[in-house]
């Protein structure tokens, strides 16, 4: 048993039929010694008396809020949550496996630049009685500070008959140098509590590996005289690290016809302009990627050819 | 200002070209190592991230763009040693920090070159003959060092009498290639920045 936060405790249980469970000793937080009784939840049934209560925790019915009283007055509470281990593996019932980039990916994170700011998100099909708290650090043995905000519901999607809920959190490394070469990964830890069930999820990454620039901005077309060609120009996204001559991007320019089946013409360039042939009803799209470290491409920025 | 299209300083340009070749070569070599050593811990998640140049050079700090010198988090340990006369520098542009930066890059390359050559000698003794260092990568390191053209005493290649542990050597190769790729990215950024300045 360990303390998650004040008056909230997590009991780790091996979960199998007829498992013996864990013996837990609860202590009433009071200077009083006599006349103390214990109840579970809002029941009036007395479980025991005395300053300590010893219970055998086997299942969810044994979890909940234990309260010690004296003479009708509440002295203190202890909320017990359960963390299930089945076949040696901690349960992952609360979050959905996103399966990207690999199986057992519950948390996904992205950064728009090298400032040390990043966003993580996760999915669940549970919509009520759910709380998350997020901690993060650089390295684990001698951790350096990363500050995370509160997790918030960022999207709801319908997937067949089910609704899926996306939660996200923003974190910022306390003292980040954009030019630094990372040798210790960022660790992100999410505590998830659904009713009386506790689970924890972790992710470990280097900022350089989760970079995904915003799409290029100010995408413009300039027709060239007496030609079907156009000059496409764009700018670095505002959120990208500066100076741009140090944090350089490379770009992919694509001409795509109305039909998805039509052949796509693609050009790769380090410049912020390119000359392409604009077909009728086609659109021109540009996306960006770090020029020197191949992490994710940005989403496309697009303009119609007409 | 986005990627200036001004004509690059011819003195600087060879280094930019060589640094791009270097990054391409080390990336290819790392990919080859990951594929060939698929049953070894060779991915970024599996290896320990060691930097053989730690406490010996300070490339990141010495080569910090001016715009980032206001960021206190970037100013942990700026070196102040002074080495001059790199052929990548046109003399009129020579500056204290730039010379220090390029000499730090040169020292990095020299250290990695020695490590890679020593390692290759061990890998050539492996009866499995599973993996060797790409000669192109070693050549590209050499070319960039020549373009930087700093006078520095040569470091003798480490030789070892004992029978090498080939498993350990291959793990070390992965660690080295990951670290060198990260340093090659920094070198490329620096060259691009200097070329645009």
């Amino acid at each position: 048993i360990w303390e998650l936060k004040k008056d909230v405790y997590v009991v780790e249980l091996d979960w199998y039929p007829d498992a013996p469970g864990e013996m837990v000793v609860l202590t009433c937080d009071t200077p009083e010694e006599d006349g103390i009784t214990w109840t579970l939840d809002q029941s009036s049934e007395v479980l025991g008396s005395g300053k300590t209560l010893t219970i055998q925790v086997k299942e969810f019915g044994d979890a909940g809020q234990y309260t010690c009283h004296k003479g009708g007055e509440v002295l203190s509470h202890s909320l017990l949550l359960l963390h299930k281990k089945e076949d040696g593996i901690w349960s992952t019932d609360i979050l959905k496996d996103q399966k990207e980039p690999k199986n057992k990916t519950f948390l996904r994170c992205e950064a728009k630049n090298y400032s040390g700011r990043f966003t993580c998100w996760w999915l669940t099909t549970i919509s009520t009685d759910l709380t998350f708290s997020v901690k993060s650090s650089r390295g684990s043995s001698d951790p350096q500070g990363v500050t995370c905000g509160a997790a918030t519901l960022s999207a709801e999607r319908v997937r067949g008959d089910n609704k899926e809920y996306e939660y996200s959190v923003e974190c910022q490394e306390d003292s980040a140098c954009p030019a630094a070469e990372e040798s210790l990964p960022i660790e992100v830890m999410v505590d998830a509590v659904h009713k009386l069930k506790y689970e924890n999820y972790t992710s470990s990454f280097f900022i350089r590996d989760i970079i995904k620039p915003d799409p290029p901005k100010n995408l413009q077309l300039k027709p060239l005289k007496n030609s079907r060609q156009v000059e496409v120009s764009w700018e670095y996204p505002d959120t990208w690290s500066t100076p741009h001559s140090y944090f350089s991007l490379t770009f992919c320019v694509q001409v795509q016809g109305k039909s998805k089946r039509e052949k796509k013409d693609r050009v790769f360039t380090d410049k912020t302009s390119a000359t392409v042939i604009c077909r009728k009803n086609a659109s021109i799209s540009v996306r960006a990627q770090d020029r020197y470290y191949s992490s994710s491409w940005s989403e496309w920025a697009s303009v119609p050819c007409s | 200002r986005n990627l200036p299209v001004a004509t690059p300083d011819p003195g600087m340009f060879p280094c930019l070209h060589h640094s791009q070749n270097l990054l391409r070569a080390v990336s290819n070599m790392l990919q080859k190592a990951r594929q060939t050593l698929e049953f070894y811990p060779c991915t970024s998640e599996e290896i320990d991230h060691e930097d053989i140049t730690k406490d010996k050079t300070s490339t990141v700090e010495a080569c910090l763009p001016l715009e980032l010198t206001k960021n206190e988090s970037c100013l942990n340990s700026r070196e102040t040693s002074f080495i001059t006369n790199g052929s990548c520098l046109a003399s009129r542009k020579t500056s204290f920090m730039m010379a220090l930066c390029l000499s730090s890059i040169y020292e990095d390359l020299k250290m990695y070159q020695v490590e890679f050559k020593t390692m290759n000698a061990k890998l050539l003794m492996d009866p499995k003959r599973q993996i060797f260092l790409d000669q192109n990568m070693l050549a590209v390191i050499d070319e960039l060092m020549q373009a930087l053209n700093f006078n520095s005493e040569t470091v003798p290649q480490k030789s070892s009498l004992e029978e090498p542990d080939f498993y350990k050597t291959k793990i070390k190769l992965c660690i080295l290639l990951h670290a060198f790729r990260i340093r090659a990215v920094t070198i490329d950024r620096v060259m691009s920045y200097l070329n645009a300045s």
Partner: antibody, heavy 120, light 107 residues
Framework: EVTLRESGPALVKPTQTLTLTCTFS??????????VSWIRQPPGKALEWLAH???????YYNPSLKSRLTISKDTSKNQVVLTMTNMDPVDTATYYC????????????WGQGTTVTVSS | SVVMTQSPDSLAVSLGERATINCKAS??????VAWFQQKPGQPPKLLIY???NRYTGVPDRFSGSGYGTDFTLTISSLQAEDVAVYYC?????????FGGGTKVEIK
């Protein structure tokens, strides 16, 4: 002893707004982990959950009725109020309030219910 | 929303015999299922929570089991006072939903 009691009009006209009050004793909505739900049961039919409010003001609604429902609490009066707009004869039912706590997450105490008929 | 399908709709059992009511969820609801008993003219009464935990004061002839999508309420030895309608309810996901009910009578 925990008790809950529902009150409100027995008859409402179609399109009118229904306001129901749940008055409770034996627990307080200022206590962490306490909540109150509203449930209804049309004559001879199954139960349907409508809305829930927690001690901290956080609330949940049945999505199919969300646009018509508002749940609120008055902690000092030990009351929870449910309003339902644009009433229709199909809303004729017995309306119950029930306590639901953060500890066993079950509706453990129910009121006796109040019958509401929607008719012109 | 999660549909809770109860079976059978009604059940006639001799006094002292076992009564079994099933409840099937349209998707996994973990163990977030409660069972209620409702007698005519009365509000529902909580019997079981977290699929298998008997609520305070509920006789031990009532037991619940199941996880995921399939749940069962068992009355091991039916008594005259057990004649009622029984409902399962999930609160894994909003909206919290009830089954259609199973009427238990004495044969």
């Amino acid at each position: 002893e925990v008790t809950l009691r529902e009150s409100g009009p027995a008859l409402v006209k179609p399109t009118q707004t229904l306001t129901l009050t749940c008055t409770f004793s034996g627990f307080s909505l200022s206590t962490s982990g306490m909540g109150v739900s509203w449930i209804r049961q049309p004559p001879g039919k199954a139960l349907e959950w409508l809305a829930h409010i927690w001690w901290d003001g956080d609330n949940y609604y049945n999505p199919s009725l969300k646009s018509r429902l508002t749940i609120s609490k008055d902690t000092s009066k030990n009351q929870v109020v449910l309003t339902m707009t644009n009433m229709d004869p199909v809303d004729t039912a017995t309306y119950y309030c029930a306590r639901r706590t953060r500890v066993n997450y079950a509706m453990d105490y129910w009121g006796q219910g109040t019958t509401v008929t929607v008719s012109s | 929303s999660v549909v809770m399908t109860q079976s059978p709709d009604s059940l006639a059992v001799s006094l002292g015999e076992r009564a079994t009511i099933n409840c099937k969820a349209s998707q996994s609801v973990s163990n977030d299922v409660a069972w209620f008993q409702q007698k005519p003219g009365q509000p529902p009464k909580l019997l079981i929570y977290y699929a298998s935990n008997r609520y305070t004061g509920v006789p031990d002839r009532f037991s619940g089991s199941g996880y995921g999508t399939d749940f069962t309420l068992t009355i091991s030895s039916l008594q005259a006072e057990d004649v009622a309608v029984y409902y399962c309810q999930q609160d894994y996901n909003s909206p919290w939903t009830f089954g259609g009910g199973t009427k238990v009578e004495i044969k």
